[in-house]
């Protein structure tokens, strides 16, 4: 609450997060022309990345393009990309939607469709929908430990969200355990009024707000965090503005003296930890 | 503008960026002693890295040291590093400029020069100039979509820079489309009075400032962002303070049961998105 | 100092860091059943990662689990994980502490102990202590160059911590060179009253605070940074809250057409650069 006689100072904050959990992923895998059911385990090293403190990412879904190599191939026949003759293909042209540079030839993509030939990582990425349900939908049960150290330099005051009295096997609950800093990902979504299973398909951004309203006067000292949650990406966003949250990364390797890569389009939840508040003192 | 009767509150912000574009890179490649012109396509997975929201990096140039292995070799003969006898080389010495630990021996680097032998990733990185013009100079035509969600918790007000009425095929222009949040990288540099082609060689840091000056009173409500751009690294910086922007990373692999790496010195532009402003309400 | 007649504005900041140094690492390496002393050199590409400006990480220790493959194996026999019959193992159960999903069978881990069989990356990670002393303990002698560009947009004022008059071969010292922005990592710890050698084992988080108290009035202009250091992680933290600072990442590769990975548990120091302060003008 506003105490006008106090000297207010904004919080200086540092955050450290630790995600726990394993996911079992079942998907169709094609090897040597034969498609069978593949089963694999994802642990933290597989689904998360060493990121900065104020943000962490949990992969919940993915699309892989395996064995890509730099060569010539027909581009993916997305809407408006098909051709019937070389006239439709312009040598040196880079379509922002495409993944390569046109050679000027119109070539067969499959038995029924022709597209412009491109110099690219081939075969080019298929523009297929993210798997539904999400492959790592069980990430809903992962937990994240959030450690937050705060400082009011002007008041020479430092504290943290985890106190020595806290129990390391707790789980945050708005009513029963509002000071526990171990959060189940599904609970964060529930608190924000969002459906984890749904968001996991395309990905999204979730805000974890930590509000410190600190009264540093010795006679009425109070300085504990309050946690709240809200979705930060726009779920109603138009296709053209790239809804959800995804990024592409590659694993490179050599085979038969040719550099190859596996391209992974990773969908997931980026959690942004937004720390704010003030310290007031007479 | 300052309305003294209003209660002002700083903005809480979350940013999400998405870079688009492909670059055609032509460079000399040596294979089996034969040098020929190499040509490759770089897409987002090749030139950018999954980074936090408030910053993104676009690689514009690089120098590769391929096939390095942990062994003994002569260090690179940079200024002041040459020797004529073992006396000049101190066993166990690590020169901060060097890439290894001296064995105490002075050995031939090539037909004319001798340097201290080091235990290092060998052959050691050559201290050669970044290629000019930059290999990915066409990154000037890449575009970045910036999504910014802001919150004034005290006023319980949230908004974002992208409105439902916006057109996903727009490009930001200071006069004609100042609310469009898709930016051509070359335009950002032009607005900041900088030369992309020049900066792309050594790399640099570019600030994209998003200023929210929000009047949240219902009778004169206004809350839209204003974009501006400024270069953040010092282009006149002394050599000793490492001008530009680059970092080294490695790709590790095994060959004939020996661990090897390819070292990449990546030059590029780091874009920092700096969101600031206040929300005022009576 | 507070000048009440001035209009104060918080600082907008951008940071760029550059770490220098090489470490010599000696450890036991097992190859083909034979254990021998291994010796390797780590340079920046090996011990640090391309991170955002406000944070950088230096690996000081690690534990490797090599040649893991997705299959079935006994889980690690940590406290409370042993079994004597299948009844103790629940098919489909994922213990948050474990690294896999139970099959329901109790199988021999070694000659004396049995544990539940899991579907996981096998062999599962051994829960062994971080090496002591830390493998990259010599990181104490690494240096970091910190470049900080600040802006007070309301006052249209920009400056940086590195001035043209500065000497690129300086090292920060609180008394003798308090404006030098090249810091020896060991000195940062000493200034913060911490023992680098000790923290390097388990890792930790170190804050580098840069305080700008700027008087922008022309008649008494002053705007230079003040550096201070404090440890941000809780060294007295209970085991259950994961003391220190570490994360796991993996290097994936194929062998005999089987995907394998090397899991690295990296311990190290995350340095958070916390920039704050105000610019005041009449």
């Amino acid at each position: 609450s506003d105490k006008l006689y106090q000297r207010k100072e904004p919080v200086i904050s540092s955050v450290h997060t630790k995600v726990k959990g394993i996911a079992e992923v079942t998907e169709n895998v094609t090897e040597g022309g034969v498609t069978k059911l593949g089963h694999s385990i994802f642990d933290t090293a597989d689904y998360t990345f060493p990121l900065q403190g104020n943000s962490f990412f949990v992969m919940t879904n993915y699309v892989k393009s395996e064995g890509q190599v730099q060569t010539l191939c027909p581009e993916y026949p997305r809407r408006g990309a098909q051709c019937s003759s070389d006239r439709r293909c312009k040598k040196g042209w880079m379509d922002p939607q495409s993944k390569g540079i046109q050679t000027g030839r119109c070539v067969p993509y499959d038995k029924t469709r022709k597209t412009c030939e491109v110099s690219a990582w081939c075969p080019t990425e298929e523009e297929k929908e993210a798997p539904r349900p999400a492959l790592l939908r069980s990430a809903e049960n992962f937990t994240v430990l959030i450690k937050n150290n705060i400082h009011f330099p002007g008041h020479n005051y430092t504290t943290r969200n985890i106190l020595p009295t806290m129990n390391g096997s707790c789980t945050f609950h708005k009513t029963w355990d509002p000071q526990c800093s171990i959060f189940r990902l599904g609970d964060i979504f529930q608190e924000a009024g969002e459906n984890f299973t749904e968001v996991a398909v395309q990905g999204g951004i979730m805000g974890i707000e930590i509000y410190w309203d600190c009264n540093l006067d010795s006679w009425s000292h109070h300085c504990r965090p309050r946690y709240s949650f809200r979705r930060l990406d726009d779920k109603n966003m138009d296709e053209s503005f790239v809804p959800g949250y995804n990024f592409r990364y590659a694993k490179y390797y050599k085979e038969n003296n040719v550099e190859k890569r596996t391209l992974i389009k990773a969908f997931g939840i980026r959690f942004d930890i937004l720390v704010f508040g003030t310290g007031g003192k007479f | 503008s300052d309305k003294l009767y209003q209660r002002k509150e700083p903005v809480i912000s979350s940013v999400h960026t998405k870079v688009k574009g492909i670059a055609e890179v032509t460079e000399n490649v040596t294979e089996g002693g034969v040098t020929k012109l190499g040509h490759s396509i770089f897409d987002t997975a090749d030139y950018t890295f999954p980074l936090q929201g408030n910053s993104f990096f676009v690689m514009t140039n690089y120098v590769k040291s391929e096939g390095q292995v942990q062994t003994l070799c002569p260090e690179y003969p940079r200024r002041g590093a040459q020797c004529s006898s073992d006396r000049r080389c101190k066993k166990g010495w690590m020169d901060p400029q060097s890439k290894g630990i001296q064995t105490g021996r002075c050995v031939p680097y090539d037909k004319t020069r001798k340097t201290c032998e080091v235990s290092a990733w060998c052959p050691t990185e050559e201290e050669k100039e970044a290629p000019r013009p930059a290999l990915l100079r066409s990154a000037e035509n890449f575009t970045v979509l910036i999504k910014n969600n802001i919150h004034f918790p005290g006023h319980n007000y949230t908004t974002r820079n992208i409105l439902p009425t916006m057109n996903g095929s727009c490009t930001f222009h200071k006069t004609w489309d100042p609310q469009c949040s898709i930016f051509r990288l070359g335009d950002i540099f032009q607005e900041a009075g900088e030369n992309f082609t020049e900066v792309a060689v050594q790399g640099g840091i570019m600030g994209i400032e998003i200023y929210w000056d929000c009047n949240l009173d219902s009778w004169s409500h206004h809350c839209r962002p204003r974009y501006s751009f400024r270069r953040l690294d010092d282009k006149n910086m002394d050599e000793s303070f490492v001008p530009g922007y680059n970092f080294r990373y490695a790709k590790y692999y095994k060959e004939n049961n020996v661990e090897k790496r390819t070292l990449i010195k990546a030059f590029g532009i780091r874009f920092d998105i700096l969101v600031f402003g206040t929300g005022g309400k009576f | 100092s507070d000048k009440l007649y001035q209009r104060k504005e918080p600082v907008i900041s951008s940071v760029h860091t550059k770490v220098k140094g090489i470490a010599e690492v000696t450890e036991n390496v097992t190859e083909g059943g034979v254990t021998k002393l291994g010796h390797s050199i780590f340079d920046t590409a090996d011990y640090t990662f391309p991170l955002q400006g406000n944070s950088f990480f230096v690996m000081t220790n690690y534990v490797k689990s090599e040649g893991q493959v997705q299959t079935l194996c006994p889980e690690y026999p940590r406290r409370g994980a042993q079994c004597s019959s299948d009844r103790r193992c629940k098919k489909g159960w994922m213990d948050p502490q474990s690294k896999g999903i139970q099959t329901g069978r109790c199988v021999p881990y070694d000659k004396t102990r049995k544990t539940c069989e899991v579907s996981a990356w096998c062999p599962t990670e051994e829960e062994k202590e971080a090496p002591r002393p830390a493998l990259l303990r010599s990181a104490e002698n690494f240096t970091v160059l910190i470049k900080n560009n600040i802006h007070f947009p309301g006052h249209n004022y920009t400056t940086r911590n590195i001035l043209p008059t500065m000497n690129g071969s300086c090292t920060f010292h609180k008394t003798w060179d308090p404006q030098c922005s090249i810091f020896r990592l060991g000195d940062i710890f000493q200034e913060a009253g911490e023992n680098f050698t000790e923290v390097a084992v388990q890792g930790g988080i170190m804050g580098i605070e840069i305080y700008w108290d700027c008087n922008l009035d022309s008649w008494s202009h002053h705007c230079r940074p003040r550096y201070s250091f404090r440890r941000l992680d809780d060294k007295n933290m209970d085991e259950s809250f994961v003391p220190g600072y570490n994360f796991r990442y993996a290097k994936y590769y194929k062998e005999n057409n089987v995907e394998k990975r090397t899991l690295i548990k990296a311990f190290g120091i995350r340095f958070d650069i916390l920039v704050f302060g105000t610019g005041g003008k009449f």
Epitope: G67, Q68, V69, Q70, T71, L72, C73, K91, G92, I101, T103, G104, R105, E117, S119, C122, P123, E255, N256, V258, K260 | E24, T26, K36, L37, H39 | -
Partner: nanobody, 120 residues
Framework: EVQLVESGGGLVQAGGSLRLLCAAS????????MAWYRQAPGKQRELVAD???????NYADSVNGRFTISRDNVRNTVYLQMNGLKPEDTAVYSC??????????????WGQGTQVTVSS
Amino acid sequence: EVQLVESGGGLVQAGGSLRLLCAASGSFFRVNNMAWYRQAPGKQRELVADITRGDRTNYADSVNGRFTISRDNVRNTVYLQMNGLKPEDTAVYSCYARIELGILEPRDYWGQGTQVTVSS
């Protein structure tokens, strides 16, 4: 001038094996897709098998399981291992390659062909 030269053809008994080889020589930037086609007397040329630079393969139904196409990217060579040969495999086998002479300058090249005869 870029050339494709085939070898390895000949006369073989039904059920036997042959290995065809085709090498690209000359000055060029990159060899992309490579393939083997065949033409039997009085019939149209048909695709036998093709292989991308990334080693993805595709076979005609009539040879699937019997023939194997492979390539060596150092030597710019494509191979066709033919097992379980049948009399109906008798034809002139020609090598095809899509080669970039310079950057974004691809052209289609054909070899002269090599005769394969399978006797019953």
